[in-house]
Amino acid sequence: GLNDIFEAQKIEWHEGSHHHHHHHHGSGSLVPRGSGSVPRWRQQWSGPGTTKRFPETVLARCVKYTEIHPEMRHVDCQSVWDAFKGAFISKHPCNITEEDYQPLMKLGTQTVPCNKILLWSRIKDLAHQFTQVQRDMFTLEDTLLGYLADDLTWCGEFNTSKINYQSCPDWRKDCSNNPVSVFWKTVSRRFAEAACDVVHVMLNGSRSKIFDKNSTFGSVEVHNLQPEKVQTLEAWVIHGGREDSRDLCQDPTIKELESIISKRNIQFSCKNIYRPDKFLQCVKNPEDSSCTSEI
C-alpha cells in the first residue's frame, strides 16, 4: 500500500483566514478596433486573451470525457457549453459571480468518492501523474468540470456576444472577479466541500512558501473542508533536489497550515516525499522490492 511506499523513501512522519485580496477593478485601457469611420472600442486587459478555439476545445473535451467515463454519458455537451458560455458572455469580465456559474455546476454534477480526494498547490503535474496511476483517487481536474477548463483562459465583453481573444483581466493587475478566477474558486470550493475522512494535499517543497495562503488551496479549499466530514488533512511535501534530506514538514508555512487546520477541528499530518520519481514508480509497482524496504 501507500504506507509501504512512503516507508521505502525514508519519509518522515509528523502528527500533528481566508485571505482577501484587495484589487481595484481595473478599467483596462480602451483601444480602437475595426475599420470604417466609426471606431469600435475593445477593453485591453493585462492578461492573455481567451485560448484560441476555446468553444471547440471545451466541447471536444466534454465529448471525450463523457466517452471515457460511462457514469457521465448522460451529459449533453452542447448544453454544458451553452451554460459555460452563458456564465461570461455579454458580462463585464471584472464583474463575474459564482451565481453566473450555477447552471454549469448543475449540468456538471458528478459524485466524487469523498475519501479519495487529492488537492494540490503549485505542483499540478505530479498530482495528475499520481492520479493517472492511482486511478481511484481524484484531483479536481479529473472531474468533468475541472477537465473542461484545465489550462484554459476565457473572457467576454460587456454587452456584446463576442469572446475576447486579445486579452483578459489579470487577477492581480486588473481584477479578481474575472471569469477564470471565479470559475476555479467556485469549483474548488465545491470540491473541498465534498471531501471526507482523510484528505490529501500535494505541496511543492521547492517553493519559498510551501503553503501559500494566497493560493487556491490556501484561500479557498482549506476553508471549505467540512470538519464534520473530514477527520484529517494529510500534506505530502514534494522535494525538488535529489540530495535534499531536510524535513520540510517543519517549514514555518507548514506549521501555519497545521495551525489553520487545527483551529478548524481537523487533524493534520505531514509527510516528506524525498524522491517523487521513486514515489510514482512505487505507486505504479508497489510489489517492487525497493518499495517495501527502507532505502
Epitope: D76, P103, Q110, E228
Partner: antibody, heavy 122, light 107 residues
Framework: QIQLVQSGPGLKKPGESVKISCKAS????????MHWVKQAPGKGLQWMGW????????TYAADFKGRFVFSLEASASTANLQISNLKNEDTATYFC???????????????WGQGTSVTVSS | NIVLTQSPATLSVTPGESVSLSCRAS??????IHWYQQKSNESPRLLIR???QSISGIPSRFSGSGSGTDFTLSINRVESEDFSIYYC?????????FGSGTKLEIK
C-alpha cells in the same frame, strides 16, 4: 417553510399507468435534486433514482429502468413519477425527497413528501 | 452497488435503556452515511447526517459515529416515541442505497 406535497392515492388495474406529482415550495427548486423512494407494504425503503432539477436529466436505479419515468414541470416547481404497465408488485407508497446538490456530492434527503399510496389490483 | 447491512433486524428494549444500531457498508464510504427514523404510516425523517452530524430539531439523545465501513446510531435512554424503524443510507455513490432497517420495539 419547506414543503413537498404529493398527489393523492390511486387504485389501478394491472397494465394501466399512474402519474404521481410532487410539488415543492419554500426553497429554490433547482438547488436540490429530487429523489424517488418506493416502500412496499411492510417492507423497507428502496431508492428508485433521482432527477436533476436544473437539466431534467433522470438517473434510475437498476430495478427501475424501463417502466418508470421521472419528469419535471420546473415552472411549477413540480417533479413527477410516471409508472406504466402497472404490475401487482408496484403496489407501494412512493415518496419524493429533496437532496442538496453540491456538484461533487449530495447531502442526505432532508425533506420528504407525505407519500402517495398506489394499489394495483384486478 | 454499495450494500448496507443493518443489524439487528429487530431490537427489543424497555424505555430508559440505551441502544446501539449498526450499519455496515460493503466498501469504505468515508463518512457518507445518514440515518433516518420512520414511524408507522409516516414519511422518513433525517436524524443524523455524515455519520455523526446532528440535525436541528432532533433530540440530543440521538448520536452517530463511525467511518469507513462500520457505523453506529446510538439512542441514549430510549423514550416511548422512539419506537419505530431506523434506516441508514449512503450518498458516497451517485447510486444511493438504503439499509434494510432496524425495528426498535418495546420489550
Amino acid at each position: 417553510q419547506i414543503q413537498l406535497v404529493q398527489s393523492g392515492p390511486g387504485l389501478k388495474k394491472p397494465g394501466e399507468s399512474v402519474k404521481i406529482s410532487c410539488k415543492a415550495s419554500g426553497y429554490t427548486f433547482t438547488d436540490y435534486s429530487m429523489h424517488w423512494v418506493k416502500q412496499a407494504p411492510g417492507k423497507g425503503l428502496q431508492w428508485m433514482g433521482w432527477i436533476n432539477t436544473y437539466s431534467g436529466k433522470p438517473t434510475y436505479a437498476a430495478d427501475f429502468k424501463g417502466r418508470f419515468v421521472f419528469s419535471l414541470e420546473a415552472s411549477a416547481s413540480t417533479a413527477n413519477l410516471q409508472i406504466s404497465n402497472l404490475k401487482n408488485e408496484d403496489t407501494a407508497t412512493y415518496f419524493c425527497a429533496r437532496c442538496y446538490d453540491g456538484t461533487f456530492y449530495y447531502d442526505p434527503m432532508d425533506a420528504w413528501g407525505q407519500g402517495t399510496s398506489v394499489t394495483v389490483s384486478s | 452497488n454499495i450494500v448496507l447491512t443493518q443489524s439487528p433486524a429487530t431490537l427489543s428494549v424497555t424505555p430508559g435503556e440505551s441502544v446501539s444500531l449498526s450499519c455496515r457498508a460493503s466498501q469504505s464510504i468515508g463518512t457518507s452515511i445518514h440515518w433516518y427514523q420512520q414511524k408507522s404510516n409516516e414519511s422518513p425523517r433525517l436524524l443524523i447526517r455524515y455519520a455523526s452530524q446532528s440535525i436541528s430539531g432532533i433530540p440530543s439523545r440521538f448520536s452517530g459515529s463511525g467511518s469507513g465501513t462500520d457505523f453506529t446510531l446510538s439512542i441514549n435512554r430510549v423514550e416511548s416515541e422512539d419506537f419505530s424503524i431506523y434506516y441508514c443510507q449512503q450518498s458516497y455513490s451517485s447510486l444511493v442505497t438504503f439499509g434494510s432497517g432496524t425495528k426498535l420495539e418495546i420489550k
